[in-house]
């Protein structure tokens, strides 16, 4: 087996997690992306897919996470804005193809998110708050339910690195409302 | 333990050829995009290319582009880079390094290759 | 492309004092911000990541703050082997991949 490895990331409130999926072109290009959360003893959960079949460069949003599939690139970019405390935890992005199980796509993000001021006077991260001031229009999320059994066994041992959540207290806006946001460059 | 060791770096006349070879170890090399960095001589740091681990997509910087060209050999772990049409600007020092899986960032670095363009 | 500016160019630092390195960007990065460590003759080290997270191995007395466009390196209390250049590096987006000009920290 393919051994699991993470990648951490430490942030303040309020930053953002901005990170980026690498996938084989010609297999997934169209295929349908998720970013979930791993808990202890838990299956994967599903925070946000793209549609099916994924659209190049077409911003989604759930919440407070934005997916960018660039096929062009063969990238799937994750962007988890307003971090709070809650959010810390362990991240995969997966594809789907169905019906064979999801793809995990390496590495795992383990995030840690701490109280604190995040910037230096003068520092600006509008790109990502005017998100919050564009008029939404919205469409049901067709994310599957299912996940790989396999994956849950393969979770590993909490590091002493993160910090714990119960399920309760992340507080992601519902799955199956997607947002369409433009593109922040 | 992650190693990286560039080879192929030598002196070359203005519109010479040299291929730079990297070989890792260490490390599942399919699964990372690696880059190319150099260092002329006394100066900073200047990102040249990058080729992506799954994807294969590449990139680079506008000083090299249509001259340089990146590639890889998942088999044999190792990262090359063609410079073709060499520029006495070109000279430098040129490391190897690996990315993280999730962003653009070099967390292991070559010792580096020279590479001395001139006439 | 994103242009990276380090200031200062060279800080005179005696060991055990405190350094606060700056680097700005032309446009906002978000948190996606890297520092590296130089010393002559040498590669490169990653310190910090992400703005502000330290890499594997790298001494809590290094640390990263900022976001968007203004970030700091701090070097709580400087040992000989903290005298260097230092780059800073964004990662933002799609390359090219763009390095400040660096900030050599010397002893006073």
């Known amino acids: 087996a393919t051994k699991l490895t993470e990648e951490k990331y430490e942030l303040k409130e309020g930053q953002t997690l901005d990170v980026k999926c690498d996938y084989t072109l010609e297999k997934f290009a169209s295929s349908q992306k998720a970013w979930q959360i791993i808990r202890d003893g838990e299956m994967p959960k599903t925070l946000a897919c793209t549609e099916r079949p994924s659209k190049n460069s077409h911003p989604v949003q759930v919440g407070r996470i934005i997916l960018e599939d660039y096929h062009d690139h063969g990238l799937l970019r994750v962007r988890m804005v307003n971090l709070q405390v809650e959010d810390s935890g362990l991240y995969q992005c997966v594809i789907y193809q169905p019906p064979k199980e999801p793809h995990m796509l390496f590495d795992r993000i383990r995030l840690v998110v701490t109280k604190g001021f995040s910037g230096t006077p003068g520092s600006n991260e509008n790109s990502t708050q005017n998100v919050y001031k564009i008029p939404p229009t919205t469409t049901k999320a067709l994310c599957p339910l299912y996940t790989s059994p396999r994956t849950v066994t393969q979770a590993p041992p909490k590091s002493t690195a993160d910090v714990s959540t119960p399920d309760s207290e992340i507080n992601l806006t519902n799955v199956t409302d997607i947002i369409r946001v433009p593109v922040f460059n | 333990e992650v190693q990286l060791l560039e080879s192929g770096g030598g002196m070359v006349q203005p519109g010479g050829s040299l291929r730079l070879s990297c070989a890792v170890s260490?490390?599942?090399?399919?699964?990372?995009?690696m880059s190319w960095v150099r260092q002329a001589p006394g100066k900073g740091l200047e990102w040249v290319s990058e080729?992506?681990?799954?994807?294969?997509?590449?990139y680079y910087a506008d000083s090299v582009k249509g001259r340089f060209t990146i590639s890889r050999d998942n088999s044999k772990n190792t990262l090359y880079l063609q410079m073709n049409s060499l520029r006495v600007e070109d000279t430098a020092i040129y490391y190897c390094?690996?990315?993280?899986?999730?962003?653009?960032?070099?967390?292991?670095w070559g010792q580096g290759t020279l590479v001395t363009v001139s006439s | 492309e994103i242009v990276m500016t380090q200031s200062p160019a060279t800080l005179s630092v005696s060991p055990g004092e405190r350094a606060t390195l700056s680097c700005r960007a032309s446009?906002?990065?978000?948190?996606?911000l890297a520092w590296y460590q130089q010393k002559p003759g040498q590669a490169p080290r990653l310190l910090i990541y992400?703005?502000?997270t330290r890499a594997t191995g790298i001494p809590a007395r290094f640390s990263g703050s900022g976001s968007g466009t203004e970030f700091t390196l701090t070097i709580s209390s400087l040992q000989s082997e903290d005298f260097a250049v230092y780059y800073c590096?964004?990662?933002?987006?799609?390359?090219?991949?763009?390095f400040g000009q660096g900030t050599k920290v010397e002893i006073k």
């Open positions: 446009q906002s990065v978000n948190s996606n």
């Open positions: 590096q964004q990662f933002y987006n799609f390359p090219p991949w763009t």
């Open positions: 992400g703005a502000s």
């Open positions: 080729m992506r681990g799954s994807s294969g997509s590449t």
């Open positions: 390094a690996k990315e993280f899986s999730s962003n653009s960032l070099f967390d292991y």
């Open positions: 260490g490390f599942t090399f399919s699964r990372y995009a």
